[in-house]
């Protein structure tokens, strides 16, 4: 009979985590909207976190937000200001592996 251990090992065997596309650097204008895309795939579905200049991104109502997408995650910044300049990094993990990608917003 199939045991839970065997099911677990089958899951482990099929697990993967891939960065499908590196994040692009973005140069944009004051007041515009910028979108950064974290394109990853994996099994089990990865958890994705966003960092700015090495610190967790602070979401701001109606201005800065991130959400899950079919390809991973999207970070959107509206009404851009010069203070938004910096390194943005997405970090994805499926519990076993970690992948990350970094882009510069100017």
């Amino acid at each position: 009979p199939t045991s839970s251990w065997n099911i677990s090992s089958e899951l482990n065997k099929d697990s993967y985590l891939t960065l499908d596309e590196p994040m692009n650097n973005i140069t944009t204008s004051l007041g515009q909207t910028a979108e950064l895309h974290c394109k990853v795939s994996g099994n089990p579905p990865p958890t994705i976190r966003w960092f700015k200049n090495d610190a967790p991104v602070v979401q701001e109502p109606r201005r800065l937000s991130f959400r899950s997408t079919i390809y991973g995650s999207r970070l959107r910044i509206r009404n851009l200001d010069t203070t938004d300049t910096g390194y943005f990094q997405c970090v994805a993990t499926n519990g076993k592996e970690v992948v990350s990608s970094t882009g510069v917003l100017f």
Epitope: K52, A55, T83, V104
Partner: antibody, heavy 120, light 107 residues
């Protein structure tokens, strides 16, 4: 070993110009923000300007905007600060610093500083 | 620009004392705060980054903490070589603004 070495400081008259250099070694120069920070005699640290050498994007403090220009030569691993229309209040030690992203979110390496004196 | 209000501006302490310096950010800067030590005639040296991470080679008597927009640098047992000026800096927003500095003097 990561190193930043500034040069080009000196005595200049008000209204004059000076160009500071920051020679970098020991790391991938184009991948890091390079900043200039200054410190007037007996005062605190004041951020001046930054450049991302890979794209030549720049940003300035309001106090120097329109007078100072930051640039970089990736073939020489060197950043520059061109200072025009200098004023007495620009008198300071000028430091270049590397922003050490991804693991160390701070200015992890600094140069030794170069003194700029604006006086008649 | 974001303001980093540092206090006290100076303090007198003795070797072995526990010393605490605080910085308050004018708005959220996440955990992107660093602390530097500067001695006369020298460039600043990084002590703490990401609010509480000890930089390589820095003695463990230095520590950092965060509570919302308040950040603290603590020296658990002051040593003779620790008499210097300390600065906080936020790095979340560009430009990376500094606090006014705290001079730690010998009592």
């Amino acid at each position: 070993e990561v190193q930043l070495v500034e040069s080009g400081g000196g005595l200049v008259q008000p209204g004059g110009s000076l160009r500071l250099s920051c020679a970098a070694s020991g790391f991938t120069f184009s991948s890091y923000f390079i900043h200039w920070v200054r410190q007037a005699p007996g005062k605190g640290l004041e951020w001046v300007a930054l450049i991302y050498p890979d794209t030549d994007d720049t940003y300035y403090a309001d106090s120097v905007k329109g007078r100072f220009t930051i640039s970089a030569d990736t073939s020489k691993n060197t950043a520059y600060l061109q200072m025009n229309s200098l004023r007495a209040e620009d008198t300071a030690v000028y430091y270049c610093a590397r922003y050490g992203y991804l693991g160390v979110g701070a200015f992890d390496y600094w140069g030794q500083g170069t003194l700029v004196t604006v006086s008649s | 620009d974001i303001q980093m209000t540092q206090s006290p501006s100076s303090l007198s302490a003795s070797v072995g004392d526990r010393v605490t310096i605080t910085c308050r950010a004018s708005q959220s800067v996440s955990s992107a705060v660093a602390w530097y030590q500067q001695k006369p005639g020298k460039a600043p040296k990084l002590l703490i980054y990401s609010a509480s991470s000890l930089y390589s080679g820095v003695p463990s008597r230095f520590s950092g903490s965060r509570s919302g927009t308040d950040f603290t640098l603590t020296i658990s047992s002051l040593q003779p070589e620790d008499f210097a000026t300390y600065y906080c800096q936020q790095l979340y927003w560009t430009p990376g603004t500094f606090g006014q500095g705290t001079k730690v003097e010998i009592k």
